[in-house]
Amino acid sequence: YDFTNCDFEKIKAAYLSTISKDLITYMSGTKSTEFNNTVSCSNRPHCLTEIQSLTFNPTAGCASLAKEMFAMKTKAALAIWCPGYSETQINATQAMKKRRKRKVTTNKCLEQVSQLQGLWRRFNRPLLKQQ
């Protein structure tokens, strides 16, 4: 999906209003310096691409993020503020249902969510005249 035509400011507002709090809840008890941030993004569409990938694509050691509250709210925000996003996600959602696993918060998941917080921070305040 090409995130170029999303309403970035509306997505930012959704993040600041609700998604950020859910990420904090997920990370509660974890030190901010515990993980090295290795994922970065260069502009807002790129940030959303990376956010989508880390939030919804299962990775080795962390298969369960898509069912977390912050992920569901992220999906809703993208569906509302990115034209045509919902349609592209139908097949992906069906595939995800087939491989549903028990919810486990692993260290790998905590690391991934720490990366997500950095990506969202970058999305919200790119040092570009985009506001």
């Epitope: 970065s40 970058r122 305040r125 570009l128």
Partner: antibody, heavy 120, light 111 residues
Framework: QAYLQQSGAELVRPGASVKMSCKAS????????MHWVKHTPGQGLEWIGA????????SYNQKFKDRATLTVDKSSRTAYMQLSSLTSEDSAVYFC?????????????WGAGTTVTVSS | DIVLTQSPASLAVSLGQRATISCRAS??????????MHWYQQKPGQPPRLLLY???NLGSGIPARFSGSGSGTDFTLTLNPVETDDVATYYC?????????FGAGTKLELK
Amino acid sequence: QAYLQQSGAELVRPGASVKMSCKASGFAFTTYNMHWVKHTPGQGLEWIGAIYPGNGETSYNQKFKDRATLTVDKSSRTAYMQLSSLTSEDSAVYFCAREDDYGEGYFDVWGAGTTVTVSS
Amino acid sequence: DIVLTQSPASLAVSLGQRATISCRASESVDNSGLSFMHWYQQKPGQPPRLLLYRASNLGSGIPARFSGSGSGTDFTLTLNPVETDDVATYYCQQINTDPLTFGAGTKLELK
């Protein structure tokens, strides 16, 4: 605990340059925008510019764009600001500050400041 | 650039009374229903300290004596009741439009 340690006071001649540092600890340095702010008793607070340590991208206040240069050294987790062609108007306290956790655009962690005195 | 005009430039308030500081922006600092206006307190020889973010949200460790309100172009910082420790200069700051700008500051003193 997030902390910013700034370099010591500087006494410089008019026309010279000064380079000050801001060493970060206690947070993921490469993922936060780092800002520089000038404080003078008469002018109050003035934003100079910001840098994103992850890729070195910068944004400057046009007023300082020609004379301020922001850089970072990721390995030492340090942000730098160089000011060139100094005049007495540049005598001030310069703060580095970290932008907040969420990208709201406020500064939640500040250095103690570097005092620059420009005098012949 | 968005110009932030603070008033008054200075004010003297009795201990236990209310202090009100205004910050008016030359254009709206609202975006998608959020107001990107922040408030700081600065004491001599110290860096500024965040008081309120997004107009009305208390910063970490800030007592509830501090409150903020407003949207669009008009914002207010209120201290009630004022304590000795509140003697300082207060600044508003906007981030909605580059460049980031601060108000000129309001100096609070005790009567």
